[in-house]
């Protein structure tokens, strides 16, 4: 496939990654399948300066990103690596709570109302953000 | 137990339509990304398409894109697969495939198959 | 749109044989594969997930290794029933791809 060299309609570029950000909300998984079938994944946060981005884009709202545990350690959906990657946790977080009566502890990674990171039941509807990098290979013919 | 049943198969001339079905029993049926998966006789296994649990999003693949439509119907537990102005290359054994609830972990759930055969 | 390869397309091995399929895809899909058993007039059945997770019921002489674009199936010791076409599927972006089969026989 060719090269993607623009955003689709609707979504934002930033240092040339694609961001798409709901305005409904989902559980974990299923906010990735959508991502998925738009060809992109939840959002992988690799610098403070992406994380100012998606923050100043989705506010204060809990927002799912593309890190969990539900395996065991800490995994980013693009095969980033977690534990040289940047990270930007709320104090004393994670905690795999298991203290919300929901069954399980908490396995994925969400945007709290300050930004900062928090684990969670990834059944919880939260928001989500889509991310796909302009410069890999595209389905879709570059829009000249 | 968890099971798909496919119908609606069957000879059709070319440029006709067809409705492919799927009825879903033993699972939460509106929990779960579903699929089109088809066979041509002889050949590997072509993806066809995918609609998400709540119906948000869905996709066709290339060979079959503006000639398919992919829906659900979570009431009635049942998966449908319209594809329009059939072509002798659209002949194939349609499977209806149930995704994992991350649709990454594949499909782990398959039915029979219902046979098309696009013929005049 | 991403392009999966197999190889070999088809081997003939012995019952006790250790067996190895490779499936290669045309750009970086994490390790979003997934790996089919399919026998002839059958539905597929998943046996591998996430490239490495063994699905639930299969038999742990099934085995899937690999990341980014080269990925591994193996068969420790093949057993009668494993006679069958093996099939690698991305699953990381749409349309999920399969790859074109590799048929196991009976040497």
């Known amino acids: 496939g060719s090269e993607r060299t623009c955003c689709p309609v609707n979504w934002v570029e930033h240092e040339r990654s694609c961001y798409w950000f709901s305005r409904s909300g989902k559980a974990w998984a299923d906010a990735d399948n959508y991502c998925r079938l738009e060809d992109a994944h939840l959002v992988v946060v690799t610098s403070w300066e992406e994380q100012k981005f998606v923050q100043h884009h989705i506010g204060p709202v809990n927002t799912w990103m593309g890190l969990h545990d539900q395996n065991g350690p800490w995994k980013w959906v693009d095969g980033t690596d977690y534990e040289t990657g940047f990270k930007n946790w709320r104090p004393e977080q994670p905690d795999d709570w298991y203290g919300h009566g929901l069954g399980g502890g908490e396995d994925c990674a969400h945007f709290t109302d300050d930004g900062r990171w928090n684990d969670d039941v990834c059944q919880r509807p939260y928001r989500w953000v889509c991310e796909t990098e302009l410069d890999k290979a595209s389905q879709e013919p570059p829009l000249l | 137990q968890v099971q798909l049943v496919e119908s609606g198969g069957g000879v059709v001339q070319p440029g006709r339509s067809l409705r492919l079905s799927c009825a879903a029993s033993?699972?939460?049926?509106?929990?779960?990304?579903m699929h089109w998966v088809r066979q041509a006789p002889g050949k590997g296994l072509e993806w066809v398409a995918v609609i998400l649990n709540d119906g948000s999003n869905k996709k066709c693949a290339d060979s079959v894109k503006g000639r398919c439509t992919i829906s659900r119907d979570n009431s009635k537990n049942t998966l449908y697969l319209q594809m329009n102005s059939l072509r002798a290359e659209d002949t194939a054994v349609y499977y209806c495939?149930?995704?994992?609830?991350?649709?990454?972990?594949?499909?782990?759930?398959w039915g029979q198959g219902t046979t098309v055969t696009v013929s005049s | 749109d991403i392009q999966m390869t197999q190889s070999p397309s088809s081997v003939s091995a012995s019952v006790g044989d250790r067996v190895t399929i490779t499936c290669r895809a045309s750009?970086?899909?994490?390790?979003?594969l997934a790996w089919y058993q399919q026998k002839p007039g059958k539905a597929p059945k998943l046996l591998i997930y996430?490239?490495?997770s063994l699905q639930s019921g299969v038999p742990s002489r099934f085995s899937g290794s690999g990341s980014g674009t080269d990925f591994t199936l193996t068969i420790s010791s093949l057993q009668p029933e494993d006679f069958a076409t093996y099939y690698c599927?991305?699953?990381?972006?749409?349309?999920?791809?399969f790859g074109p089969g590799t048929k196991v026989d009976i040497k």
């Open positions: 750009q970086g899909i994490s390790s979003w």
């Open positions: 599927q991305q699953t990381n972006s749409v349309p999920f791809t």
């Open positions: 495939a149930r995704g994992q609830q991350w649709l990454v972990n594949g499909v782990d759930v």
């Open positions: 033993g699972f939460t049926f509106s929990s779960f990304g």
């Open positions: 996430a490239a490495s």
